[in-house]
């Protein structure tokens, strides 16, 4: 039998054993997240298994989502959602010591397929573990890419109250329109559920002590949420290690100074 | 000094009504979200009501419900629940609290938990 | 509404350690806060956010959390720490505060 011809892409292919990855943190998740203990987590793996294979990777969709992300409905409180750019590991550690703020990760969805990679072909039942599109060599509408944008919008769409974003001071855009908060959840923030945003920018250097807050891509943010009718607000996170700390444990006495 | 100061406990009949008030002292009222507990006689501590700082959302517990409306007058550094429809089983000692919240590098943080307590006020509902 | 089960009363030695539990249906991201009530007292809260310990508690009192449990430690067991000790959580789904039923701690 002749090896029949794969699409060659860009990108790595789909993270070893897939399916058993997502199935597994999907009963992990449910088992310690009891509001969503009525969740069946072979229908999930159906659902997210229907939405990128026999499809050609470079044409998925939104709407393939949908189910996945019916089934993955969950709401945060009010007051609770954080956003990051750029700064993923530390806005998780954060809410690692802050339990009660939730990223995209620490929901089910985005808890599933964080770090991951996938992608099937068109017409075979087939996982593509040699290769998948990367989003700028091959193609935007490619599974990974369009998961994300459709969860981003979707947490984004649910927020309410003040909604929190960590941004990375140390980039030389600190707002990007382009990344995933600048281009999909800034503009699916609901006016109506949203008071304010306040975003905190997280310093790099030890001894930056400008305020960050007055960057001309910050002034931008500003500008974009304003215009929305949401207000914003701005805040300087200088040493984001002793932030981690004093998050912890607020009462330590070097945490009792406004440093 | 950080305390809180409770009043307008008493004794009143059963389907009557009755207002408590609690008073904060030396913390910024208006920053703090604020809580009324109660304790029976004999008994344990039993969650009422709980109030945004701003007094924008109010929570309550299944008991009191319809029955009761927690409120506050920042202005006034001043907490207060309106008890309707008393029954037998409201008789207890009522205690307001502020919940605990810090800012952590200008970042204010709910702590889930009781910080300050008042020294309570007693309301006996009995004919 | 998730319960929170405590044992109803323990009972130790000046010197001894003893341990209070609390368990129930907690949710990983609520945490457990735990308030000592002296005989004709208001509350006292004695840790915070499962493990923590505001300034002027003593660091005999300590606090732990495994999954869907929680105690409260207290060494060198001295006899002002006859008292009743709750433990509590918020709720950050359902709004609600959630408190045990109470320990009653013995001095012998």
């Known amino acids: 039998v002749l090896p029949r011809w794969r699409q060659q892409w860009s990108g790595s292919g789909t993270t070893s054993r897939f399916p058993e990855t997502v199935l597994a943190r999907c009963v992990k998740y449910t088992e310690v997240h009891p509001e969503m203990r009525h969740v069946d987590c072979q229908s999930v793996w159906d659902a997210f298994k229907g939405a990128f294979i026999s499809k050609y990777p470079c044409n998925i969709t939104e709407e393939d989502y949908q189910p996945l992300v019916k089934l993955g409905t969950q709401t945060v409180p009010c007051n609770k959602t954080l956003l990051w750019s750029r700064i993923k590991d530390l806005a998780h550690q954060f809410t690692q010591v802050q339990r009660d703020m939730f990223t995209l990760e620490d929901m089910l969805l985005g808890y599933l397929a964080d770090d991951l990679t996938w992608c099937g072909e068109f017409n075979t039942f087939e996982i593509n573990y040699q290769s998948c599109p990367d989003w700028r060599k091959d193609c935007s509408n490619n599974p990974v890419s369009v998961f994300w944008k459709t969860v981003s919008r979707r947490f984004a769409e649910t927020a309410c109250g003040v909604v929190h974003v960590m941004l990375n001071g140390s980039r030389s855009k600190i707002f990007d329109k382009n990344s995933t908060f600048g281009s999909v959840e800034v503009h699916n923030l609901q006016p109506e559920k949203v008071q304010a945003l306040e975003a905190w920018v997280i310093h790099g250097g030890r001894e930056d002590s400008r305020d960050l807050c007055q960057d001309p891509t910050i002034k931008e943010l500003e500008s974009i949420i304003s215009k929305r009718n949401i207000r914003f607000f701005c805040k300087n996170i200088y040493r984001p290690d002793k932030f981690l700390q004093c998050v912890k444990n607020p009462e330590d006495s070097s945490c009792l100074s406004g440093i | 000094e950080v305390q809180l100061l409770e009043s307008g406990g008493g004794l009143v009949q059963p389907g009557g009504s009755l207002r408590l008030s609690c008073t904060g002292f030396?913390?910024?009222?208006?920053?703090?979200?604020m809580s009324w507990v109660r304790q029976a006689p004999g008994k344990g501590l039993e969650w009422v009501a709980d109030i945004s700082s701003y007094g924008d959302n109010t929570y309550y517990a299944d008991s009191v419900k319809g029955r009761f409306t927690i409120s506050r007058d920042n202005s006034a550094n001043t907490l207060y629940v309106q008890m309707n429809s008393l029954r037998a089983e409201d008789t207890a000692v009522y205690y307001c609290?502020?919940?605990?919240?810090?800012?952590?590098?200008?970042?204010?943080?709910?702590?889930?938990?009781?910080?300050?307590w008042g020294q309570g006020t007693t309301v006996t509902v009995s004919s | 509404q998730s319960v929170l089960t405590q044992t109803p009363s323990v009972s130790g030695t000046p010197g001894q350690r003893v341990t209070i539990s609390c368990s129930g249906v907690?949710?990983?991201?609520?945490?457990v806060s735990w308030y000592q009530q002296l005989p004709g007292t208001a509350p006292k809260l004695l840790i915070f956010?499962?493990?923590q310990r505001p300034s002027g508690v003593p660091d005999r009192f300590s606090g732990s959390r495994s999954g869907t449990s929680a105690s409260l430690a207290i060494s060198g067991l001295q006899s002002e720490d006859e008292a009743d000790y709750y433990c509590a959580a918020w709720d950050i789904f359902l709004n609600v505060w959630v408190f045990g039923g109470g320990t009653k701690l013995t001095v012998l």
């Open positions: 609290a502020k919940r605990m919240e810090r800012e952590v590098m200008t970042i204010k943080l709910d702590y889930h938990a009781m910080d300050v």
């Open positions: 956010k499962d493990d």
């Open positions: 907690f949710n990983i991201r609520n945490y």
């Open positions: 030396g913390f910024t009222f208006t920053d703090a979200r």
